[in-house]
Amino acid sequence: IFPLAFFIYVPMNEQIVIGRLDEDIILPSSFERGSEVVIHWKYQDSYKVHSYYKGSDHLESQDPRYANRTSLFYNEIQNGNASLFFRRVSLLDEGIYTCYVGTAIQVITNKVVLKVGVFLTPVMKYEKRNTNSFLICSVLSVYPRPIITWKMDNTPISENNMEETGSLDSFSINSPLNITGSNSSYECTIENSLLKQTWTGRWTMKDGLHKMQSEHVSLSCQPVNDYFSPNQDFKVTWSRMKSGTFSVLAYYLSSSQNTIINESRFSWNKELINQSDFSMNLMDLNLSDSGEYLCNISSDEYTLLTIHTVHVEPSQETASHN
């Protein structure tokens, strides 16, 4: 009945509603139908959120923070529905809401506890700092404080640095991991326990490839079945690291099935893409193509990073000319 938030029933006419920052929620309240309905929603027993009586809203003394953000289900009031539709919740809206309903036959009071969570999609980044390589799991805005765990080759790592910046409403978190010289696979999980939402980033380094100039290279990129759900929107980006920064070669959007290619020598196999295989070919290699190639498959729930190191060597022909 209430699709915009989920709630947990607890004793004493009290319910817990969990909403997401900037989304709309419903604070539920029901009563035994009757005439002369009076509805008063209050926050923390002090601030007027919404009042309805004598068949219409009375918002003259509504607290300004709720202006244009609340409404009732007017066609449902006569059926015993006093629920409050609440627009664009913020973290400041967290707390206890009391719904007072009076009718010609009774008065009831319901309490609803609103908890608000934030979970802007995290990212996993691969960075080179001088001679060091780092994986960074970061989330720009999250609340409450998340649980971050790292695994190396599926084994939990105790080392877990967390750089945290707290703003008025949420946390910004970076968790860097030094992976210099490692060929292991790494996994980072960020969990928001309130929203029951988990995001996973996975990093895999493939064996280095040695190619001759003018040859072509095929680089594999296939999602791990554990994470990948084809009916969920995702984006695939292939990029190449040059002098410490990545430049995008091509990307694919699952929602529109669009492929954008920025490098004329790059090719993607449409049939393979339809089978969720995002391996790519780079034709006519030259020496400057040496470097690291990164395939990034990302959705709201995961990021899968695959790194290939390509070494392009001069062909015999070129070498003999020199």
């Epitope: 008063h40 209050k42 009586y53 004598k54 007072y100 009076g102």
Partner: antibody, heavy 121, light 107 residues
């Protein structure tokens, strides 16, 4: 059963003050708005003031605004009317009356027996 | 303030008669009108709310009608116990106001 019992009436000189009380029982006091209504001897009824169930809203008739103050103590199930700067025309039987619900409806389902206030020099 | 005017001011009728009291508001009050009965030396008693809803425990010979500015209270068959003064009251807006009352006498 619902009971409202007023007290505190008496004879007072013009310009003086008086405090009326109303003791409530037989219902959950903190769920209901309470009004004061008065009736001058041999005359009709006049609404005086209301306080909502939680004390958040108070409204007064023009004839008493600024002189009378309505208040309630939900922990003691009592309602009060502080009457200052009394005038001869304030002479009346004062009733406390329970609203249908929060105080927002504005009609009177249960009444006390009244207490007489006489303002006279 | 909204003025409420009742008519007649006094009314004399016999037991068993059908009695009608009218109440006029100086501006529209929708259906936000109540009727009270007050017996001598007693507090008023609620009879009708929202113009036509009978309060619990009130005999069914009492009924109310009207909306906007014109309202009536009807006693379908007058009983000796109905000797009282009847008041209408608007609760559309603060300040709440009463009619001046209709005194009903039994012939």
């Amino acid at each position: 059963q619902v009971q409202l019992v007023e007290s505190g009436g008496g004879v007072v000189q013009p310009g003086r003050s008086l405090r009326l009380s109303c003791a409530a029982s037989g219902f959950t006091f903190s769920d209901y708005g309470i009004h004061w209504v008065r009736q001058a001897p041999g005359k009709g009824l006049e609404w005086v003031a209301v306080i909502w169930y939680d004390g958040s809203d108070k409204y007064y008739a023009d004839s008493v605004r600024g002189r009378f103050t309505i208040s309630r103590d939900n922990s003691k199930n009592t309602l009060s009317l502080q009457m200052n700067s009394l005038r001869v025309e304030d002479t009346a039987v004062y009733y406390c009356a329970r609203d249908r619900s929060s105080g927002a409806m504005g009609y009177f389902v249960y009444w006390g027996q009244g207490t007489l206030v006489t303002v006279s020099s | 303030d909204i003025q409420m005017t009742q008519s007649p001011s006094t009314l004399s009728a016999s037991v068993g008669d059908r009695v009608t009291i009218t109440c006029r508001a100086s501006q529209s009050i929708s259906s936000w009108l109540a009727w009270y009965q007050q017996k001598p030396g007693k507090a008023p008693k609620l009879l009708i709310y929202k113009a036509s809803s009978l309060e619990s425990g009130v005999p069914s010979r009492f009924s109310g009608s009207g909306s906007g500015t014109e309202f009536t209270l009807t006693i379908s068959s007058l009983q000796p116990d109905d000797l009282a003064t009847y008041y209408c009251q608007q609760y559309n807006a603060y300040s709440y106001t009463f009619g001046q009352g209709t005194k009903l006498e039994i012939k």
